[in-house]
Interface confidence: medium
């Protein structure tokens, strides 16, 4: 079950819930946003204060890391399996250091299997964080510091830090280095969403959340 099912079962308070995959006993703890846009959102990534190191290995990004109440990555394997069960939407919520907020909403999102390097698939962009997708289209394979699957002759994950669906290296990286206020400009390896804040601007906060399309 995901946060949408938790919501439908009567739990309408934001918080950390234990989720499971269909036909599986494997459990994962995730933060559920039960208020935003009707609730039922499973948070798959959050950045807010730089308390968690996001320069992690392939295995760590596979299984997840961090604290679901704070900064964390839910895990590529869980998200891949979940988003291949039914159609999901992806909402990415962004905050800058000037008090502005924006979002990108993709009407269809799923990750390929690990054998296909958790390649991201996205369709139907709307929202206020740019008319062009800051996640390169068509989607790229996931790369980490120990798994170079990008389209650059360089190693994007090593240079820019963090695991991401790097192109060469692409217009976004929400798992980059966390830079505090007044140190957040001219930072190519920061938390980037190019088509909202341009080059070199490192964001204050990000949340990636998913929900079934038919919720």
């Amino acid at each position: 079950r995901d946060c949408a099912e938790v919501f439908k079962s009567g739990h309408t308070t934001n918080g950390v819930y234990t989720l499971t995959l269909p036909n599986s006993t494997e459990e994962v703890k995730a933060y559920c946003d039960m208020e935003a846009g009707g609730g039922g959102w499973t948070i798959i990534q959050r950045r807010e204060d730089g308390s968690v190191d996001f320069q992690r290995t392939w295995k760590e990004y596979k299984v997840g890391f961090g604290n679901p109440s704070g900064e964390y990555w839910l895990g590529n394997e869980f998200v891949s399996q979940l988003t291949n069960q039914q159609r999901y939407v992806l909402k990415i919520h962004l905050k800058d250091w000037e008090g502005n907020e924006a979002y990108s909403l993709y009407e269809h999102f799923y990750l390929s299997s690990e054998e296909l390097n958790y390649r991201i698939h996205l369709k139907g962009l709307t929202g206020t964080a740019g008319k062009i997708s800051s996640i390169s289209q068509p989607g790229n394979d996931f790369s980490t510091k120990d798994a170079d699957n990008d389209k650059c002759i360089c190693k994007c994950s090593q240079m820019l830090t963090g695991g991401w669906w790097f192109d060469a290296c692409g217009p976004s990286n929400l798992n980059g280095m966390y830079y505090p206020q007044r140190q957040n400009t001219n930072k190519f390896n920061g938390i980037k969403w190019y088509y909202w804040k341009g080059s070199g601007y490192s964001l204050k906060g990000t949340t990636m959340m998913i929900r079934p399309a038919d919720f």
Epitope: C152, C154, A168, G200
Partner: antibody, heavy 122, light 107 residues
Framework: EVQLLESGGGLVQPGGSLRLSCAAS????????MSWVRQAPGKGLEWVSV????????YYADSVKGRFTISRDNSKNTLYLQLNSLRAEDTAVYYC???????????????WGQGTLVTVSS | DIQMTQSPSSVSASVGDRVTITCRAS??????LAWYQQKPGKAPKLLIY???SLQSGVPSRFSGSGSGTDFTLTISTLQPEDFATYYC?????????FGGGTKVEIK
Amino acid sequence: EVQLLESGGGLVQPGGSLRLSCAASGFTFRKYAMSWVRQAPGKGLEWVSVISVSGGNTYYADSVKGRFTISRDNSKNTLYLQLNSLRAEDTAVYYCAKDLTDIVLMVYVDYWGQGTLVTVSS
Amino acid sequence: DIQMTQSPSSVSASVGDRVTITCRASQDIDRWLAWYQQKPGKAPKLLIYAASSLQSGVPSRFSGSGSGTDFTLTISTLQPEDFATYYCQQANSLPFTFGGGTKVEIK
């Protein structure tokens, strides 16, 4: 094979203008940041300007700011540098340069053109 | 602006020698440094990026090290084709700046 072919250089009087072009082939031009780097005769390398993949972000060395303009036409796979109010100290070979990545704030040049000579003299 | 200072400005060496060139940044640039080789009348060629990452196709006798303000380019066994001028360049912040160059000459 990546190729960058500059053109447009030549002799120009102080205060004059030139437009340099760089025709790119062998790679997906629209996916990479592009730069201009120059080298005065017998001197070292000097970074001039860089432009982002979309053309929306441009940056310049202080020595050329307000006089030079970098632009790109992704449909034509071409990079440009408009040189105005030219001075004798702008005399140099101008290289068109492809970045290793698309990150406009990190210029590692992995491919260079052959260069085009700009001579500013009366 | 970040100033990049290379030393020595020239070095005389023989084929087979180990050659070390240093580059110092006027402020911390983490590991955002590149090394280029340039031969007379030719465009520069990228050897090393991100301080120590060897560019594809570059012989393994070239290596880079360092972080912060002090960086080194080493040619482990000098070959005849390595006689050239070498430049370091910081990619940490705008404006991007190059070192003055080090000319490796035949002894």
